[in-house]
């Protein structure tokens, strides 16, 4: 089932997705799409990275994190009710059927009646758990020609992830409300 995240109309929404690049030079291609992850690729692609860059994006969708260090979390600017729905983060690990697929549900709530001035990157998010694929411990290593070696394992809890991460600082600095549960 999808993990749910929330934002208010007019704010920026944040959908977390992480992995750990195994080698500095070669990132793993990642795609973000609107709609649940299909068998291959992403449907309705809104943003895509390759081995080094963000190489495709559409208006309002961008990566604000250290994407070259594996933080491929998606920011959606100035959301509307139409942005509600399922989003797919797909980490395209070389090899057959090796992709990590995450479905994240974004719920947009109407803005409060008395709007407070919002700062850039303000958002309110519910984080039941953090979706990560980080190299902590044993995992199968896939190698394909000149593509990068990937060493990936999953970690599930937000608390562990936030304890010493930049994200915690970013969230605090942006005035965000974090709910864990």
């Amino acid at each position: 089932s999808e993990v749910e995240y929330r934002a208010e109309v007019g704010q920026n929404a944040y959908l977390p997705c992480f992995y750990t690049p195994a080698a500095p030079g070669n990132l793993v291609p990642v795609c973000w799409g609107k709609g649940a992850c299909p068998v291959f690729e992403c449907g309705n692609v809104v943003l895509r990275t390759d081995e080094r860059d963000v190489n495709y994006w559409t208006s309002r969708y961008w990566l604000n994190g250290d994407f070259r260090k594996g933080d491929v979390s998606l920011t959606i600017e100035n959301v509307t009710l139409a942005d509600s729905g399922i989003y797919c983060c797909r980490i395209q690990i070389p090899g057959i059927m090796n992709d990590e697929k995450f479905n994240l549900k974004l719920v947009i709530k109407p803005a409060k009646v008395t709007p407070a001035p919002t700062r850039q990157r303000d958002f309110t998010a519910a984080f039941p758990r953090m979706l990560t694929t980080r190299g902590h411990g044993p995992a199968e290593t896939q190698t394909l020609g000149s593509l990068p070696d990937i060493n990936l394992t999953q970690i599930s809890t937000l608390a562990n992830e936030l304890r010493d991460s930049r994200l915690a600082n970013d969230l605090r600095d942006s005035g965000a409300t974090i709910r864990i549960g």
């Epitope: 500095p24 030079g25 070669n26 081995e51 080094r52 860059d53 963000v54 190489n55 994006w57 961008w62 990566l63 604000n64 994190g65 250290d66 994407f67 070259r68 600017e77 000149s146 593509l147």
Partner: antibody, heavy 120, light 107 residues
Framework: QVQLVQSGAEVKKPGASVKVSCKAS????????MDWVRQAPGQGLEWLGY????????SYNQKFKGRVTMTTDKSTSTAYMELRSLRSDDTAVYYC?????????????WGQGTTVTVSS | DIVMTQSQKFMSTSVGDRVSITCKAS??????VAWYQQKPGQSPKLLIY???NRYTGVPDRFTGSGSGTDFTLTISNMQSEDLADYFC?????????FGGGTKLEIK
């Protein structure tokens, strides 16, 4: 210490090709991207493309696609940038620059520059 | 292509001044911006990477700030050796693009 040493100045006629070399030392050549940037006289900086010596992967600025080729020789830790069908507005100083992963692919080391003059 | 705009081509300054050079991206580039210093006849030198990280050996009077589309390089205590051209660059998406440069001059 890290050094990028480029080949000497070139004078070319319109329509000709030029191949600039960049010899790297002081680091593991295959661990870092090599980008190429040029600067026309009195102008700003313009990115031509990059090559990843580890696997030969390249990405070129669309503006130069079909005219530029980047290669490396791992045995000599040397990167090459060839520009074909030269025009007068290709007159510029051409730099190789190391794309540092830990500096988010900004350029932590630059070559001294190679002046390419295109004139009939 | 993402356009990086440095609106001030020249800035007059005096030793000891606080100088702020601005750079605006045509669309969000996160924090993927670098600042370079270039003196006449020399190659550019990296000052700031990832918008606010001072590169090794760069004096702490140089500070970078900003995120998204608006970025600033600040020199807190201008020195004569800081007279140079300054370029911003986005490395979020290729083609990587540079601002047109800002030249610091003495008043």
């Amino acid at each position: 210490q890290v050094q990028l040493v480029q080949s000497g100045a070139e004078v070319k006629k319109p329509g000709a090709s030029v191949k600039v070399s960049c010899k790297a030392s002081g680091y593991t050549f295959t661990d870092y991207y090599m980008d190429w940037v040029r600067q026309a006289p009195g102008q700003g900086l313009e990115w031509l493309g990059y090559i990843y010596p580890n696997n030969g992967g390249t990405s070129y600025n669309q503006k130069f696609k079909g005219r530029v080729t980047m290669t490396t020789d791992k045995s000599t830790s040397t990167a090459y940038m060839e520009l074909r069908s030269l025009r007068s507005d290709d007159t510029a100083v051409y730099y190789c620059a190391r794309g540092g992963y830990y500096s988010y692919y900004s350029y932590d080391y630059w070559g001294q520059g190679t002046t390419v003059t295109v004139s009939s | 292509d993402i356009v990086m705009t440095q609106s001030q081509k020249f800035m007059s300054t005096s030793v000891g001044d606080r100088v702020s050079i601005t750079c605006k991206a045509s669309q969000s580039v996160g924090n993927n911006v670098a600042w370079y210093q270039q003196k006449p006849g020399q190659s550019p030198k990296l000052l700031i990477y990832y918008a606010s990280n001072r590169y090794t050996g760069v004096p702490d009077r140089f500070t970078g700030s900003g995120s998204g589309t608006d970025f600033t390089l600040t020199i807190s205590n201008m020195q004569s050796e800081d007279l140079a051209d300054y370029f911003c660059q986005q490395h979020y998406s290729s083609p990587y693009t540079f601002g047109g440069g800002t030249k610091l001059e003495i008043k």
